[in-house]
Each structure stands twice: as structure tokens, then as C-alpha cells.
Amino acid sequence: KFSKQSWGLENEALIVRCPRQGKPSYTVDWYYSQTNKSIPTQERNRVFASGQLLKFLPAAVADSGIYTCIVRSPTFNRTGYANVTIYKKQSDCNVPDYLMYSTVSGSEKNSKIYCPTIDLYNWTAPLEWFKNCQALQGSRYRAHKSFLVIDNVMTEDAGDYTCKFIHNENGANYSVTATRSFTVKDEQGFSLFPVIGAPAQNEIKEVEIGKNANLTCSACFGKGTQFLAAVLWQLNGTKITDFGEPRIQQEEGQNQSFSNGLACLDMVLRIADVKEEDLLLQYDCLALNLHGLRRHTVRLSRKNPIDHHS
């Protein structure tokens, strides 16, 4: 039930996360299931446990097996299982199916290929990308953070893509590779200069002091899946995260919707316990894509309590 498949190549780093995650700070114990032997936590070991992570630095074929992780508390232990398989490196260029991560699809307008599992590792840019063992070269290919962007995707771009990066652990470097298939969708999409549907430009939003308020920034960017489109809020020209007011938060992640076939995004700004000083701020809804940036400004005003007359 709480089991997860993980795989890697011999002599590469492999990091596995416990499938039963607790909140941060809980004690996690790891065991090799076949022998019930505890995995050490000392980093001098080739295989060691580090909280919710199990690290093989580097991995060996003999490490294959089922590992048990137990997130511990005196009243409620939560057990998970990591089914780890380490394979010998192939001498030819073919990547067997059992080494492939999930397939991703792209189109002419959207061609991001994320490097699988990379978030578990301590790596630094840039990533190296390969297709059929050939290093990707040319201006059409751009390694950006943890993903590859292909400009002007064509059907010939379909295939198996391998990302390669270096994991650093206490000054020692270990290589990691991961491969996934990329398919190309024939999508007659297009991209527009952002159109903000809400809020209206210079809108005045009535709020009640002491209550919570939500502002939604909603914009459309064209038809079909969009590449590099975003909506966000700013306060007095500053990013929400940099503004430093914990009562005012952007909703995590952007909701994507398709309105009349258009690709739209919205971002909710939540203001908890509205205060007088919030009425003095300028709230900017920003929508941006490759065409440019559009901004709509909102200000808050105090909602007057309704007078009840008989």
C-alpha cells in the first residue's frame, strides 16, 4: 500500500524518499527489509539514511531490494517501503523501458521536459541533456533550471531524453542520469499578449476591517497549452514574498483553466484580518508571457456597515 518503486544505475548517486512522509522534524528510521538490518545515519557510509531520504552514494547492483522506512512517534508509527532496483550500465545507447520515467507531451508552444527526481538532489546548474546518447546542441535547446526547453518543436523531436547532473554531498561529486520519453502533440494553439479578465483596471475593492479578503488575478494568454505564462500579485511594486507581511499570501500554485478554449491562469491573494494600513497599499495584478507584461491595479476601500432602518 505504501510502497514506491525507485531505480538507478550502478556507480551513480540514487536518493529515495520515504513514501510515508510525516511532517518535518519527525524521526525516520530505515531498514533493509530482507535482513531487518538498520541503515546507518553516518555519512561516511556508502548507503546511509538522512531523515526522510535514503542515499546511495554511489549505488551498487547489490543494493537492490526492499527498504523499510518508519516515521516514528510514540503513539503512531507510519511505515513505508521503497522498492529499489540498481541496474548495470548499458554498453549501447538504448535505454530499456525499466529505466524510463513517465512520458511527457509537448507541442509547438509548450515544450518543457522536466528532469525526473532532480529535486531530491543537491545539484547546481546547468543540466546536461542528451537525446539518443547525443548531447543536445544548437539554439533550439535551452537548459533552464531543472527542465529542457525546445523551441519550435517538430514531430522529429519526439524521443527519449536523458538529463545528467552532478549531486554534491560533503564535497564529493556523484553523477546522476534520468531518462524519459517526450511525445509531440499536434496542437493548433496560439499565444496572445496577456488579457486580464479580473480585476478591472483601477478597481476599488470594498473590504471589512478585521475580516478576511480575497483578490483574484485572472488572465488569458492564448489557445492551447502555453509556455512561460504566469500571473502574480505585487504589493506597492514588491513581490508578495519580499513584502514581509505574513497576513497577505498568494495562493500556492496557479490554477489553470480553459475558458472558451483559451488558456487562462488565476492567482488568489488572501488577506487575513484586514487592517487599516492595508487600505493604503497598491495591489497590482500582473500577467506576463513571451509577448510582454500587463498590469491592473486595485485599491481597497472600507466597506461601510449597512444601516438597518425599520
Epitope: F2, G22, K23, Y26, S73, P74, T75
Partner: antibody
């Protein structure tokens, strides 16, 4: 988003059995976690009644154990509380909640149960 | 059962000031490097809301004005600076063993 909602009669006669149901939406109760009942007499503090884990194991507060049963209806994604032989001292707001490890991170809004003839 | 005793029973603090609530356990709730003490906030007519877990870890979405400390039998919840919206009852809860128990609560009023 996980949501919990208590339901059941608001008035129970002394010596009868109090029965409450908690309906969970947004998560299958047999997938993981523990599912609690907690009560709060008017103007007083919180008392943990017990919980049932996703595996079906139950843990009860010894002070109530002889009178308490917590069970699950998987088909409706509900869990229930039965408290027998009630007295006026059982009058309280009854909450259902979800426990992840040690803490209740999602709660219902609570339902007031009054024990009176 | 582990008995949790909170003090004070109530306190009044001005906005911008510091509020400190303590919780004392009848026996240690710490083991294996963790302290199994947690804090909740309850406003009138609402269910409790988790603030702090394992003595000092801030629950996701809770403002950094709230902090917890302590180990063994003595624990503290601190709110600094206090805001008007913090008026509520605060409860400690342990999970060192069954049964899980709560403190009797501390009422925080804003002057």
C-alpha cells in the same frame, strides 16, 4: 481539500446511547491517518475520546473506554461515535478530526449534544 | 494519564506586546530527540487550529509571530508581537502516550 462534518441528534436522554457520524470529503479514510473524536463541555477544555486508524485499529481514552465505540463505514467514507449510558456530564460540543502523526490537523465544525430528559 | 497544567488561566496583552503561555506536564513528554507537545488556538464558535507541533515546529500557514519552545516537562508558547486577531483560547496537547490529553486552556485577551 479535506473536510469533515459531524451529524447526529442534538438531544439525547440520560442512560441512552449518543450516536454521531463524521462524513469525510476530499480523502479516503481507509487510505491513511487516524480519525478522532474529541469533545468540549460548554465553557470547558478539550477531551480526547479516541480514534480509529486507517487500518481499523481503535484507541480509546481509558476514562470512557467502557462506554465508547468508534467504527468506520467505508462505503460512505464516514466514521462514527457511539457513547452509551450518557449522563448530563456528557453534554458537550463533539468534534471529529484527522490525526496525521500526533496532531489533529483537520477538524469538523463541531456539533452540540445535550443530554437531558 | 499525563496531566497538562497551563498557566496563566487567562492573560491580557496589548497589541504589539509579547504573550507567553506555559504548559507543564506531570511527566516528561520527550523521547528519542523529540518533544511530543503541540499547541492549538481556538476562537469562539470554531474548532481548534494547530499552531505548533513537536514543541517548536510551526505548522504550515501559521504566522511566524507564534513560536514554541521547551523539552521534558516544561513548554512555552510565545506570541510576539500580539495582534488583535490573536484573542482566543490556547491549548497544549501531548502525544507521548495514550490517552492523548490537553491542557485546561489559557484565555488570551487583547487590551
Amino acid at each position: 481539500q479535506v473536510q469533515l462534518q459531524e451529524s447526529g441528534p442534538g438531544l439525547v436522554k440520560p442512560s441512552q446511547t449518543l450516536s454521531l457520524t463524521c462524513t469525510v470529503s476530499g480523502y479516503s479514510i481507509t487510505s491513511d491517518y487516524a480519525w478522532d473524536w474529541i469533545r468540549q463541555p460548554p465553557g470547558k477544555g478539550l477531551e480526547w475520546i479516541g480514534y480509529i486508524r486507517y487500518s481499523g485499529d481503535t484507541y480509546y481514552n481509558p476514562s470512557l473506554k467502557s462506554r465508547v465505540t468508534i467504527s468506520v463505514d467505508t462505503s460512505k467514507n464516514q466514521f462514527s461515535l457511539k457513547l452509551s449510558s450518557v449522563t448530563a456530564a456528557d453534554t458537550a460540543v463533539y468534534y471529529c478530526a484527522r490525526t496525521m502523526m500526533d496532531t489533529m490537523d483537520y477538524w469538523g465544525q463541531g456539533t452540540l449534544v445535550t443530554v437531558s430528559s | 494519564d499525563i496531566v497538562l497544567t497551563q498557566s496563566p488561566a487567562s492573560l491580557a496583552v496589548s497589541p504589539g506586546q509579547r504573550a507567553t503561555i506555559t504548559c507543564r506536564a506531570s511527566k516528561s513528554v520527550s523521547t528519542s530527540g523529540n518533544s511530543y507537545m503541540h499547541w492549538y488556538q481556538q476562537k469562539p464558535g470554531q474548532p481548534p487550529k494547530l499552531l505548533i507541533y513537536l514543541a517548536s515546529n510551526l505548522e504550515s500557514g501559521v504566522p511566524a509571530r507564534f513560536s514554541g519552545s521547551g523539552s521534558g516537562t516544561d513548554f512555552t508558547l510565545t506570541i510576539n508581537p500580539v495582534e488583535a486577531n490573536d484573542a482566543a483560547n490556547y491549548y497544549c496537547q501531548h502525544s507521548r502516550e495514550f490517552p492523548l490529553t490537553f491542557g485546561q486552556g489559557t484565555k488570551l485577551e487583547i487590551k
